[in-house]
């Protein structure tokens, strides 16, 4: 039998059963999540669940830019350092940079400082590029 790889929406890229959309629009975290949802297909700000997934995403984004942080779907809604993925994925894989936590920083970004492989926390009302994800 021929197994067809699912197709992603135009402008999105496919990796290991998921579609990813990198949006070079400046949005705060909650508006970015709403925009991801608006694309349908159950899309949310992206969860990153393994080093392999992180590396694939980082390589893709580096083809566009290497200097601006990017919102992902990890947040601390209770503001108690209890981080969770907005799409409900298990928070097992972690890739925080050394100086991530503290202050009024309850949303996570991929940091440009380490080629998007590590995360930092930031104030959720900052407007940044963002990454969406869905399973086709």
């Amino acid at each position: 039998d021929i197994i067809m790889r699912p197709s992603c929406a135009p402008g999105w890229f496919y990796h290991k059963s998921n579609c990813y959309g990198y949006f070079r629009k400046l949005r705060n975290w909650s508006d970015a999540e709403l925009e991801c949802q608006s694309y349908g297909n159950g899309a949310h700000l992206a969860s990153i669940l393994s080093l392999k997934e992180a590396s694939t995403i980082a390589e893709y984004i580096s083809g566009y830019q290497r200097s601006q942080p990017i919102w992902i779907g990890l947040h601390d809604p209770q503001k108690r350092q209890q981080w969770q993925w907005i799409d409900g994925a298990m928070y097992l894989y972690r890739s925080w940079s050394g100086k991530s936590m503290g202050g009024n920083k309850h949303c996570a970004e991929m940091s440009s400082n380490n080629n998007f492989l590590t995360w930092s926390s930031n104030e959720c009302n900052k407007r940044q590029h963002f990454l969406c994800k869905y399973r086709p």
Epitope: R24, K25, L26, R27, N28, Y64, Q65, Q68, N125, K126, R127
Partner: antibody
């Protein structure tokens, strides 16, 4: 219809602070992002910064620590304060509504001259 | 900061002519490019958003194209009310920046 109107002194002394008010009608400033943009003699436009519906700010790094944008939601006004002005700050100052990325509504602009 | 370079600086045309205005970005900005028109002693007016998306109330003779670093605003059959300054603006990264403008003047 959304309307914005800038007001404030047309003449400011060097080293003093420039303070302007933007009065908004037809739209609550608790929606969208509200921006100050200035146009220098010769027509160059410079984005100065905004105050967001969520009270967030972003400023142009070129203005260093001289700029502050605040708001009064009860009066539906937002404000620009620019400290330590020089003749280089002589410009027409516009307030505008940012509709996520672009500027759909602008005030008429107010000329501010910095001179002794 | 992203620098937007507009050309030509001045364009002298006759009403009825069709013209193209260029805006070049110093780095890739995707489709985060918008165009404005400003008449003398007035505030700028949004013409085109996201490179090519039309704006309600703006005549269809204005159209935009391009991507990443190179963008064009086309005016089909220029009318007298079109004379003035044209600016491009990027919203890809902070700080937002504007081009230095193209002046469209009557020949």
């Amino acid at each position: 219809d959304v309307q914005l109107l800038e007001s404030g002194p047309g003449l400011v002394r060097p080293s003093q602070s420039l303070s302007l008010t933007c009065s908004v009608t037809g739209n609550s400033i608790t929606s969208y992002y509200w921006t100050w943009i200035r146009q220098f003699p010769g027509n160059k436009l410079e984005w100065m910064g905004y105050i967001g519906y969520d009270d967030s700010n972003e400023y142009n790094p070129s203005l260093k620590n001289r700029i502050s944008i605040t708001r009064d939601t009860s009066k539906n006004q937002f404000f620009l304060k620019l400290n330590s002005v020089t003749s280089e700050d002589t410009a027409t100052y516009f307030c505008a509504r940012e509709d996520y990325d672009w500027f759909a509504y602008w005030g008429q602009g107010t000329l501010v001259t910095v001179s002794a | 900061d992203i620098v937007l370079t507009q050309s030509p600086v001045i364009l002298s045309v006759t009403p009825g002519d069709s013209v193209s205005l260029s805006c070049r970005a110093s780095q890739s900005i995707g489709n985060n490019l918008h165009w404005y028109h400003q008449k003398s002693h007035e505030s700028p007016r949004l013409l085109i958003k996201y490179v090519s998306q039309s704006i309600s109330g703006i005549p269809s003779r204005f159209s935009g194209s391009g991507s990443e670093t190179g963008f064009t605003l086309r005016l089909n059959s220029v009318e007298t009310e079109d004379f003035g300054m044209f600016f491009c603006q990027q919203s890809n990264s902070w700080p937002f920046t504007f081009g230095s403008g193209t002046k469209l003047e009557i020949k």
